[in-house]
C-alpha cells in the first residue's frame, strides 16, 4: 500500500495472507485474500496462474505481520484452489481475475471466528456502492513502487470509487476496463494499492454493512496520476462464487 497507515488484523479480520512454499523449503509472500466463509478465501487468479499447485500454498488468518507470528493467528493448507477458467491477461488488463481457496488446518478444521478472524459479507448481485464512495484496501504490498521488500506490518488506506465513464477515458485506461471491473483511487493520487496487494480486499460500507466490493487486480504503476487501481467487481461474480462453494454451509451471501 502506497501511503495510508499501518494497521492490525483486528481492523481487517477477514484479511488472509497467502504464502508459497518453495522447493528448497523457503516461504515467500504471494498475495492477499479475504475470508468469505469459514472454509473459503477469495483472491485473484493472477496470483496463482504461474504456480497452480494447491500443495505449494499456505494461508494465514489473524496475522498482522508478514514474517512473524501474531497471537491467535491460524495456519491453513489449501484443500482446493479454484482459478477462473476464463482468466486472461493478454494486455495490461486482467479479465476474470478471481480465485477461491478452500482452506483446512492440519487438524482438518476451517477458520474459527475470533477477535482477529471474521468473515466479510459478499454484496448482492450487481449491487455496488455509488461512485465517489470511500472504501478501504488492505495488504502487505510495497510502500513505494521502487521498493525491493514488502513492509513487515499490515497496511491499509482509503480510496474512492471512480465511475466507469471516467476510468474508460483514453488517458486513464480506455476500453481495457470492462463492466466486470471497478476503478478506485485517491483524488490526489497519493495513496494506492501496489505490488503485493493483489488478491486483497476492497471493502466498502453498503447498506450499513462492511462488504467485499472488489479484489485488488491490476493497474499501471502505483499511485500514478490518472492510473487508478482496478479491482475485480465481486458483485458480478456471485454465480461463479456460489457454483464453486455451494457444497459449503454458512457462506455469507
Amino acid at each position: 500500500i502506497i501511503g495510508g497507515e499501518f494497521t492490525t488484523i483486528e481492523n481487517q479480520p477477514w484479511f488472509a495472507a497467502i504464502y508459497r512454499r518453495h522447493r528448497g523449503g523457503s516461504v515467500t509472500y504471494v498475495c492477499g485474500g479475504s475470508l468469505i466463509s469459514p472454509c473459503w478465501v477469495i483472491s485473484a487468479t493472477h496470483c496463482f496462474i504461474d504456480y497452480p499447485k494447491k500443495e505449494d500454498y499456505i494461508v494465514y488468518l489473524g496475522r498482522s505481520r508478514l514474517n512473524s507470528n501474531t497471537q491467535g493467528e491460524m495456519k491453513f493448507e489449501v484443500e482446493n484452489l479454484i482459478l477462473h477458467k476464463d482468466y486472461s491477461a493478454d494486455t495490461l488488463a486482467h479479465h476474470n481475475d478471481i480465485a477461491l481457496l478452500k482452506i483446512r488446518s492440519k487438524e482438518g478444521r476451517c477458520a474459527q471466528p475470533s477477535r482477529t478472524i471474521q468473515t466479510i459479507c459478499l454484496p448482492s448481485m450487481y449491487n455496488d456502492p455509488q461512485f465517489g464512495t470511500s472504501c478501504e484496501i488492505t495488504g502487505f504490498g510495497k510502500e513505494n513502487s521502487t521498493d525491493y521488500l514488502y513492509p513487515e506490518q499490515l497496511k491499509m488506506t482509503v480510496v474512492k470509487l471512480i465511475s466507469h465513464r471516467e476510468c474508460q477515458q483514453p488517458h486513464y485506461y480506455g476500453s481495457e476496463v470492462t463492466t466486470k471491473m471497478l476503478c478506485a483511487a485517491d483524488p490526489q493520487w497519493k495513496t494506492d494499492s501496489c505490488q503485493g496487494d493483489s488478491g486483497g480486499p476492497l471493502v466498502c460500507s453498503l447498506q450499513g454493512r462492511m462488504t467485499l466490493t472488489g479484489i485488488v487486480s491490476w493497474g499501471r504503476g502505483c499511485a500514478l496520476k490518472d492510473k487508478p487501481g482496478v479491482y475485480t467487481r465481486v458483485s458480478h461474480f456471485l454465480p461463479w462464487i456460489r457454483s464453486h462453494t455451494k457444497e459449503e454451509n454458512g457462506l455469507a451471501l
Epitope: H46, D90, L92, P170, C194, G219, R220, G221
Partner: antibody, heavy 115, light 112 residues
C-alpha cells in the same frame, strides 16, 4: 503449428480502399486478440491496431490511422481483417498480422499506394 | 504516446563477443503486479519479426538462452552473451502497457 496466412495486398490509387485478410490455423482463433503492424519500405515497425477476442467485447484500439482503418474478425472462418479506406501514399508498407499482442507474425503483405 | 529510444542504432559485433542494446521509455512500463510490458523482437533480413523476449525478461519459446532481457520501469536492456552469425538483423523493443503500442527505432546488428 500456428500459421497466419495474409492476403489482399497490392497496388492501389490514393483515396481508394483495400481490405487485407489474415487467415489463421493451428490455434483456437476465437480465444485470441489479433494485432496489425506495418513497416514502410526501409523503415521501422509501426503499430496499427488491435482487436480483442469476442469474450472481451471484440473491441478495437487504433494508432494514428483511426477513422480510416477498421479491424474486424470472423471467428467462424478464423480470419482477421484490416479494412483500409481513403488510402494515402504514406500508407505504403508491408502489413503484418499478429496473434495476440506479440506472439506469432504473418508473412506480411505489401500495400503500395501510388497514382 | 509513449516514446521508446533505442541505442545504439548500429552495432557491429565480432562473432563470439557479447552485445548489448538499450531501450529507454518516456514513461514507466511496469504494472502494479511487477510486470514490465516491454517486448524485444528480431527482424532478420527479408523475414517477419520474431518475438525474442516478452514482459521484459521472459524468453519466448525456442529462443536460444544466449538472449536475455533485463531492466524495469523505464530502462531496459537486451543482451546477447555470444553473438552468432545468424543473429544479424534489426532488433526492436515494443511497449504494450498503453495504447497506441509503440516501437523503438530499431538497432541494426551486423557482423564485423
Amino acid at each position: 503449428e500456428v500459421q497466419l496466412v495474409q492476403s489482399g495486398g497490392g497496388l492501389v490509387k490514393p483515396g481508394r480502399s483495400l481490405r487485407l485478410s489474415c487467415t489463421a490455423s493451428g490455434f483456437t482463433f476465437g480465444d485470441y486478440a489479433m494485432s496489425w503492424v506495418r513497416q514502410a519500405p526501409g523503415k521501422g515497425l509501426e503499430w496499427v491496431g488491435f482487436i480483442r477476442s469476442k469474450a472481451y467485447g471484440g473491441t478495437t484500439e487504433y494508432a494514428a490511422v483511426k477513422g480510416r482503418f477498421t479491424i474486424s474478425r470472423d471467428d467462424s472462418k478464423s480470419i482477421a481483417y484490416l479494412q483500409m479506406n481513403s488510402l494515402k501514399t504514406e500508407d505504403t508498407a508491408v502489413y503484418y498480422c499478429i496473434r495476440g499482442a506479440n506472439w506469432n507474425w504473418g508473412q506480411g503483405t505489401l500495400v503500395t499506394v501510388s497514382s | 504516446e509513449i516514446v521508446l529510444t533505442q541505442s545504439p542504432l548500429s552495432l557491429p559485433v565480432t562473432p563470439g563477443e557479447p552485445a548489448s542494446i538499450s531501450c529507454r521509455s518516456s514513461q514507466t512500463l511496469m504494472n502494479r503486479n511487477g510486470n514490465n510490458f516491454l517486448d524485444w523482437y528480431l527482424q532478420k533480413p527479408g523475414q517477419s519479426p520474431q518475438l525474442l523476449i516478452y514482459l521484459g525478461s521472459n524468453r519466448a519459446p525456442g529462443v536460444p538462452d544466449r538472449f536475455s532481457g533485463s531492466g524495469s520501469g523505464t530502462d531496459f536492456t537486451l543482451k546477447i552473451s555470444r553473438v552468432e552469425a545468424e543473429d544479424v538483423g534489426v532488433y526492436y523493443c515494443m511497449q504494450r502497457i498503453e495504447f497506441p503500442y509503440t516501437f523503438g527505432q530499431g538497432t541494426k546488428l551486423e557482423i564485423k
